[in-house]
């Protein structure tokens, strides 16, 4: 899925509002240096697909997240917020219902959590340029200049 | 426990230039979007610029950019400003500080500054 | 760039009562139902503390004595009671538009 027009405005919204209470809630107990950050995004829409990625797409140690709390709400605001995302998880959300429902917090599904936190974070305030400046890195972001 | 830790006091000449530092521990550094703000008795508190450790990535108050240079050491988890062309205008506390963990936009842990004295 | 313009620039107020700081943006600092307004205190020789976030948020460690209200482009930082230890510059920022702005501070003294 192409993040590129989804209001990124009104995600980062429902982050602020909900989803980082819940991602809280699920850290709760760990340490915020426990972990190494190893993943990263360069701008609103990669974030997003980053994201995705780490919140639905089950890993070796850690198949259980697309089940958490945090997890539906960012579906729920993907799915409002992008044009045509539901669609497009269709597939996805069949495969997830054959996952088995036990919800089991191991240390690498903290860690995924933990990397998912900076990636929030980094969405929510990418660095942007001032207008009039010629270094733009990000130019996914150009047209979100004033509002992030 | 968050903390960052500022190089000391700094007198330099008008027209040089100075370089200081703000090393960070108890956080994950690299995730963080780490900001410069000047604090003078007469203007207050100026946003400066900030840099995205992850990438290095930059933003800069237009009023500074030509004169500001943020970077960092990702390996000892330190944030650079120097600052060139000095003047008597930039004799004043220049503050690091860490964007809070949800991309509020808000300054939640500071260092202790850094006096730059700018005189002949 | 947003110019954040404070009043009054200092006040006087006596122990145990209100002090109301206004904070006012040339333009709105609100953003999908958000006011991205935060406020801070500062005392002489140390950095700023994060009093308030999002308006009205109380940051770590702070006294429910503070408290914040507005949107759009007004914004008021209330201390309620005041006590001894208030004493200090008070600033607004806004982040909602970059550049990142202050306000120019309010000075609270005591009677």
């Known amino acids: 899925y192409d993040f590129t027009n989804c209001d990124f405005e009104k995600i980062k919204a429902a982050y602020l509002s909900t989803i980082s209470k819940d991602l809280i809630t699920y850290m709760s107990g760990t340490k915020s240096t426990e972990f190494n950050n190893t993943v990263s995004c360069s701008n609103r829409p990669h974030c997003l697909t980053e994201i995705q990625s780490l919140t639905f797409n089950p890993t070796a140690g850690c198949a259980s997240l697309a089940k958490e709390m945090f997890a539906m709400k960012t579906k729920a605001a993907l799915a409002i917020w992008c044009p045509g995302y539901s669609e497009t998880q269709i597939n996805a959300t069949q495969a997830m219902k054959k996952a088995r429902k036990s919800k089991v917090t191991t240390n690498k599904c903290l860690e995924q959590v933990s990397q998912l936190q900076g990636l929030w974070r980094r969405f929510n305030r990418p660095l942007l340029k001032q207008q009039g400046s010629s270094d733009y890195k990000d130019d996914d972001d150009k047209h979100h200049h004033h509002h992030h | 426990q968050a903390y960052l830790q500022q190089s000391g006091a700094e007198l330099v000449r008008p027209g040089a230039s100075v370089k200081m530092s703000c090393k960070a521990s108890g956080f994950a550094f690299t995730t963080y979007n780490m900001h410069w703000v000047k604090h003078t008795p007469g203007q207050g508190l100026e946003w400066i610029g900030a840099i995205y450790p992850g990438n290095g990535e930059t933003s800069y108050n237009q009023k500074f950019k030509d004169r500001a240079t943020l970077t960092v050491d990702k390996s000892s988890r330190t944030a650079y400003m120097q600052l060139s062309s000095l003047t008597s205008e930039d004799s004043a506390v220049y503050f690091c500080?860490?964007?809070?963990?949800?991309?509020?936009?808000?300054?939640?842990?500071w260092g202790a500054g850094t006096t730059v004295t700018v005189s002949s | 760039d947003i110019v954040l313009t404070q009043s009054p620039a200092s006040l006087a107020v006596s122990l145990g009562q209100r002090a109301t700081i206004s904070c006012r943006a040339s333009e709105s600092v609100d953003n999908s139902g958000l006011s991205f307004m935060h406020w801070y205190q500062q005392k002489p020789g140390q950095p700023p503390r994060l009093l308030l976030y999002?308006?009205?948020n109380l940051g770590s460690g702070i006294p429910a004595r503070f408290s914040g209200s507005g949107s759009g482009t007004d914004f008021t930082l209330t201390l309620n009671p005041v006590e001894t230890d208030d004493v200090a510059t008070y600033y607004c920022q806004q982040i909602n538009t970059d550049p990142l702005t202050f306000g120019a501070g309010t000075k609270l003294e005591l009677k």
């Open positions: 500080a860490r964007e809070d963990d949800y991309g509020e936009g808000y300054f939640d842990v």
């Open positions: 999002r308006a009205s």
